[in-house]
Interface confidence: low
């Protein structure tokens, strides 16, 4: 397929990504499945200047990234090697915390109002970022 | 350079108990889940436990579960897998593995459970 | 859990001859999948993660595709040191599980 280039229209280019930052809420999984038929997936942090510039664009609101366990071990939306990454945590998380009465633990990973990281009952129905890579064949199949 | 070495293995006797340890170092070992797998004479790879950098999250397969026990001290940059009542089937080479996707291995250990 | 297949099981190829193995799973496991190579008397050696992702100091030769449940790994021109069992391994969900193996020998 052909390379794309440049960003689509409402989308943010950024290191040869492009973003895409909602003003909505969905839970977890309708926030991948947009992302996916965008051609895209939700955003993977892999370093700390990645972490600040979505940080500035999203704001104080619970956000959600491309980080999930829920077969078990934390992993990245694309196949990003979550242990030897970057992470950003807040203090005591994640913490799969069961109290919050919903069922269940928390398996989804959202930025929070200061940008670190928690995890999150995955239903719950926060902001989303969809990222897409740049030089990438825009006739690929999306990253599921 | 990333460099894991396993000891500890050697002939036990059905029932008995092993304890196999894995020295990591070339990378900062806190960091990093850590896996045990195994390997029987002539036969595949069977992935036995896994342990996270801070020892929150642990899995075993169920041939092992109960009778095996992972453990980690960051502090000595050391992965450990106390092995009880051991079985004849136990007997493989052990291997300890860096992160899910197994990207660094130890050279191995033989355990052999005989009588 | 998660079942893993590959085929073949094994292969007899010559110097300078492309190989492809085949790595299915059982369900879908995304991009969850990494190859090993592993000489006789020796452990298991990286190759690949993310289905496609070489590792550090592996020769491009080697390569992998796939998403889903279905995967390959392809060696452009097999070389001598190249004679070997693959394995294929999914990191989706625990327990971890590998392929059987396809033993590579020389024809």
């Known amino acids: 397929g052909s390379e794309r280039t440049c960003c689509p229209v409402n989308w943010v280019e950024h290191e040869r990504s492009c973003y895409w930052f909602s003003r909505s809420g969905k839970a977890w999984a309708d926030a991948d499945n947009y992302c996916r038929l965008e051609d895209a997936h939700l955003v993977v942090v892999t370093s700390w200047e990645e972490q600040k510039f979505v940080q500035h664009h999203i704001g104080p609101v619970n956000t959600w990234m491309g980080l999930h366990d829920q077969n078990g071990p934390w992993k990245w939306v694309d196949g990003t090697d979550y242990e030897t990454g970057f992470k950003n945590w807040r203090p005591e998380q994640p913490d799969d915390w069961y109290g919050h009465g919903l069922g269940g633990g928390e398996d989804c990973a959202h930025f929070t109002d200061d940008g670190r990281w928690n995890d999150d009952v995955c239903q719950r129905p926060y902001r989303w970022v969809c990222e897409t890579e740049l030089d990438k064949a825009s006739q690929e199949p999306p990253l599921l | 350079e990333v460099q894991l070495v396993e000891s500890g293995g050697g002939l036990v006797k059905p029932g008995g108990s092993l304890r196999l340890s894995c020295a990591a170092s070339?990378?900062?070992?806190?960091?990093?889940?850590m896996n045990w797998v195994r390997q029987g004479p002539g036969k595949g790879l069977e992935w036995i436990s896994s342990i996270s950098g801070s020892s929150t999250d642990i899995y075993y397969a169920d041939s092992v579960k109960g009778r095996f026990t992972i453990s980690r001290d960051n502090a000595k940059n050391s992965l450990y897998l106390q092995m009880n009542s051991l079985r004849a089937e136990d007997t493989a080479v052990y291997y300890c593995?860096?992160?899910?996707?197994?990207?660094?291995w130890g050279q191995g250990t033989l355990v052999t459970v005989s009588s | 859990d998660i079942q893993m297949t590959q085929s073949p099981s094994s292969l007899s190829a010559s110097v300078g001859d492309r190989v492809t193995i085949t790595c299915r799973a059982s369900q879908g496991i995304s991009h969850y999948l990494a190859w090993f190579q592993q000489k006789p008397g020796k452990a298991p050696q990286s190759l690949m993660s993310a289905a496609s992702g070489l590792q550090s100091g592996v020769p491009s030769k080697f390569s992998g595709s796939g998403s889903g449940t279905d995967f390959t790994l392809t060696i452009s021109s097999l070389q001598p040191e190249d004679f070997a069992t693959y394995y294929c391994q999914q990191y989706q969900n625990y327990p971890f599980t590998f392929g059987p193996g396809t033993k590579v020998d020389i024809k």
């Open positions: 070339g990378f900062t070992f806190s960091n990093y889940r």
């Open positions: 593995a860096r992160v899910a996707s197994f990207d660094y």
